[in-house]
Interface confidence: low
């Protein structure tokens, strides 16, 4: 049904009125305002911005806007003892040192408080030793090194290129391989697009540019000292030795000028194949250690960063629903940045600001949404999704009972080629229907719908005539809502035509060069892509908060469950003999998926026919839709990952950014041929099939007629 049918909606106050109020010029103005100084989590500057946003959201017309503060573990370089990496000769003299900071971009030379590049939460240490080049430091890269090349990383300092997977996974892999330090660098192969100039003349990474970022392995825990509970005034904090997810070896990031100096001397083994070579003029030798002439030289890291409990501030705005005020649709994105945040996060925060302004304008004219809309400006996302997770921990009982949907709003752009959407299958139809109603901003698609340009540029690999929609992974603030609480979630942004580099980010990601000018000059001068993203995010929120029947289609879940069951069965069938030996059957899972499909189909039929004027029945049907995502939550969580509780989706154990389907079964099967106790390993596969089958069946039954 259209939003016009919602209670208290006059024809003027429909989706079109909301969308028409969104203006590209305002987004531009807000982006400029949010990016003039750094807004690092835990700093005075970011607190001031929180208060500014609180004040402006109140002016825009929200019913209430509050700050929610928490005292969480953050990490900063030591001001008087900078971090760097050296090459030392046999006498211990430093013959080369990496840069201490990025050369500031034009116009920003006199800006204070630019945090130098560092790996947040690195322990202190000054390890020295031989270097081993480990490609992207993925699981498969260490398999290649250790199993095929027989190279031992124990006691070595490893150097890994950024890209492909979350940096925290790289560090975890290096630790497990026995490394005593990690150097992360940006290779031009991954962060320098051919034919484009370096910033400030283009959007490519200059040689002195460096990607900052946290290197935690939190697995959804939030604040490392208070897992599961909010870091409030009376919190009990773990000792640092018991903190969740902290790395145990020093880690530091560098740019490709400095990387060249380290890699050009590498000796030892040649790279195993061309996939290990980047674009620098170096041999990409794996090591260990330097080549003949330089064999007595070592690498030394100097890391002096400190972990400190620091206050952070979320801004939480409320627009009360007129009919179902106890049902919450949440739009959230973070405010903290590594430096200026030109793309991450302020291109997203500016869009949220304009969405709030548009909703506020409608509210001032007497309109209210059917359901309550919560707007959030999260703090400390860059330090491990801390602000959103702490708030969700504090409000978990309300959220699990009242949370309808969460729409994420980090960076609005990572390119300007086409739309990119990751969401729960429940939202597929909502996204399809909405994008068919929006104009495409793309050149060559004038007068065409966003759906049309998106489908043309990013087609679904399975269904012709439909666009690709990806699984939710993690690495952003939807994590706690979706993976822990089971609240239907989605995200949308404009992206690049660069599928192979999906998880590497744009070239200037987390560098000092991520400025307002980067966006205004090179990515979106007319702010038309930002406006489109505002329409998609805002339109989703509008429909979720305002449609009489929730715009969720449970049949789409049935389709993907079958696809995921087929996929995991295929993986298992690579071991037919073991499946026979240990009596491994997927029958229960396929049976549960079949039941889900049938029940979902019947539910959808009832959804078309029921009496929508009966508020009790309407509420009952909507609750079944709202609680369907919740039904996929296992209260015990995944093995060794208690805060990843969604049985259908979890962040990949090998790459936090990527989503994995049936993650419990997938992880049980992963590298199973190398397990020392096959009987135990295949027993765990069987247990995970049981958990998945039970969960799918239980979820299906929530859609059955209630009595």
């Amino acid at each position: 049904k259209s939003s016009n049918e919602a209670t208290n909606i006059t024809p003027k106050h429909n989706m079109k009125a909301f969308l028409d109020e969104l203006k590209a010029e305002n987004i531009k103005k807000f982006l400029y305002n949010f990016t003039q100084i750094p807004h690092l989590a835990g700093t005075e500057q970011n607190f001031q911005l929180a208060k500014q946003i609180q004040s402006q959201w109140k002016e825009f017309g929200l019913d209430s806007v509050e700050l929610a503060h928490y005292d969480v573990l953050l990490s900063y370089p030591n001001k008087t003892h900078p971090n760097y990496i050296s090459i030392i000769n046999e006498d211990g003299n430093e013959i080369f040192n990496t840069s201490l900071f990025e050369p500031p971009p034009p116009g920003y030379e006199n800006v204070s408080d630019i945090v130098p590049p560092f790996s947040a939460f690195s322990p202190q240490g000054m390890p020295e030793g031989d270097l081993v080049y480990v490609n992207y430091a993925r699981t498969e890269d260490f398999f290649k090194l250790e199993r095929d090349m027989k190279i031992n990383c124990s006691g070595k300092i490893v150097i890994a290129r950024y890209g492909k997977v979350f940096r925290g996974n790289k560090v975890k892999n290096a630790q497990l391989a026995g490394a005593k330090g990690v150097i992360l660098y940006s290779d031009p192969a991954d962060y320098f697009a051919p034919g484009v100039k370096s910033y400030p003349d283009g959007w490519n990474l200059p040689g002195g540019g460096v990607q900052r970022g946290n290197i935690l392995n939190l697995n959804g825990a939030g604040d490392p000292l208070t897992p599961g509970y909010p870091a409030n005034e009376y919190a009990y904090r773990r000792g640092i030795a018991e903190a969740v997810g902290l790395p145990s070896i020093p880690v530091h990031p560098i740019g490709y000028y400095d990387a060249q100096k380290l890699l050009e001397k590498m000796g030892g083994s040649a790279p195993p194949d061309s996939s290990w070579r980047g674009s620098l003029k170096v041999p990409y030798n794996v090591g260990p250690g330097f080549t003949g002439n330089f064999s007595t030289q070592k690498v030394k890291m100097h890391i002096h960063s400190t972990n400190e409990v620091t206050r952070i501030y979320n801004v939480i705005g409320t627009l009360r629903g007129a009919v179902e005020p106890d049902r919450y649709v949440i739009l959230g994105g973070h405010r903290d940045s590594w430096v200026f945040g030109g793309i991450d996060p302020q291109s997203g925060a500016a869009v949220v600001h304009e969405i709030v302004r548009s909703f506020g304008t409608l509210k001032k004219e007497g309109w209210r949404p059917r359901r309550t809309i919560l707007f959030a400006s999260w703090d400390a996302e860059e330090f491990g999704l801390l602000g959103s997770t702490e708030w969700a921990e504090e409000n978990s009982r309300l959220l699990q009972e009242r949370g309808v949907a969460y729409i994420n709003a980090d960076s609005s752009i990572e390119g300007n080629y086409t739309l990119r959407v990751d969401c729960t299958p429940l939202m597929y139809s909502l996204v399809h229907n909405l994008t068919k109603e929006l104009k495409s901003p793309d050149e060559g698609f004038e007068g065409k719908s966003l759906y049309e340009s998106w489908t043309k540029k990013s087609p679904s690999p399975e269904f012709s005539g439909m666009p690709r929609i990806s699984k939710l992974g993690s690495g952003n603030d939807f994590e706690v809502f979706f993976q822990r609480l089971g609240i239907a979630s989605g995200r949308a942004r404009y992206t690049k035509n660069w599928e192979t580099n999906k998880f590497s980010g744009y070239p200037l990601y987390h560098s000092v060069y991520e400025t307002y000018e980067l966006v205004e000059k090179f990515y979106d001068p007319m702010f038309k892509y930002h406006l489109t993203v505002a329409q998609v995010r805002g339109g989703m929120v509008f429909e979720l908060a305002n449609s009489i029947v929730l715009p969720f289609d449970c049949r789409d879940y049935a389709v993907v469950l079958r696809k995921y069951a087929d996929k995991i069965y295929s993986i298992s069938m690579k071991h037919p003999q073991e499946m026979k030996t240990y009596s491994v059957s997927f029958d229960s899972l396929f049976s549960a998926v079949k039941n889900f499909t049938e029940i979902a189909s019947k539910f959808s039929e009832r959804l078309q026919d029921f009496d929508k004027s009966n508020p009790i029945v309407l509420r009952m049907m909507n609750d079944q839709l709202m609680f369907l995502e919740r039904a996929f939550i296992d209260p015990l969580g995944l093995p060794d990952r208690p805060f990843y509780r969604h049985v259908i989706y979890a962040p990949s154990s090998h790459n936090k950014y990527a989503g994995e389907s049936f993650p419990g079964i997938y992880d049980a099967l992963f590298d199973i041929e190398s397990k020392v106790d096959p009987s135990k390993a295949w027993g765990e596969v069987k247990r995970q099939i049981y958990v998945a089958a039970f969960t799918v069946q239980a979820a299906a039954e929530t859609l059955s007629e209630v009595a």
């Epitope: 835990g42 005075e44 030591n78 008087t80 900078p82 900071f101 006199n110 408080d113 130098p116």
Partner: nanobody, 124 residues
Framework: EVQLVESGGGSVQPGGSLRLSCAAS????????MTWVRQVPGKGLEWVAN????????YYVDSVKGRFTISRDNAKNSLYLQMNSLRAEDTAVYYC?????????????????GGQGTTVTVSS
């Protein structure tokens, strides 16, 4: 306006000594940490040493420890770097810089580098 003028550079043989000076004006010198950085042509800036407002804390990059000494005279608005046992790898343009404290004192901030620098060449 912040002004920083470096002097005292020159050519010297390995093992020799030089004393660099920096005359500061345009700001309250005694309110700021001060820093020496250096740049080898074609390479990035390298932090060398820094000194607290009252001179009570000094920090050095490992490669110069025991050879270089940073000092200051707040009465004269001057910063110094005594460089002993010079090596070829110390060859660089040396700049003095005002460490911009800002609101957060937890990390190494950007620095105001107003001067043209003074060149130190160490070769036999």
């Amino acid at each position: 306006e912040v002004q920083l003028v470096e002097s005292g550079g020159g050519s010297v043989q390995p093992g020799g000594s030089l004393r660099l000076s920096c005359a500061a004006s345009g700001f309250t010198f005694s309110d700021y940490w001060m820093t020496w950085v250096r740049q080898v042509p074609g390479k990035g800036l390298e932090w060398v040493a820094n000194i607290k407002q009252d001179g009570s804390e000094k920090y050095y990059v490992d490669s110069v420890k025991g050879r270089f000494t940073i000092s200051r005279d707040n009465a004269k608005n001057s910063l110094y770097l005594q460089m002993n046992s010079l090596r070829a790898e110390d060859t660089a343009v040396y700049y003095c810089a005002r460490d911009r404290g800002g609101a957060v004192a937890l990390y190494h901030n950007g620095m105001d580098m107003g001067g043209q620098g003074t060149t130190v060449t160490v070769s036999s």
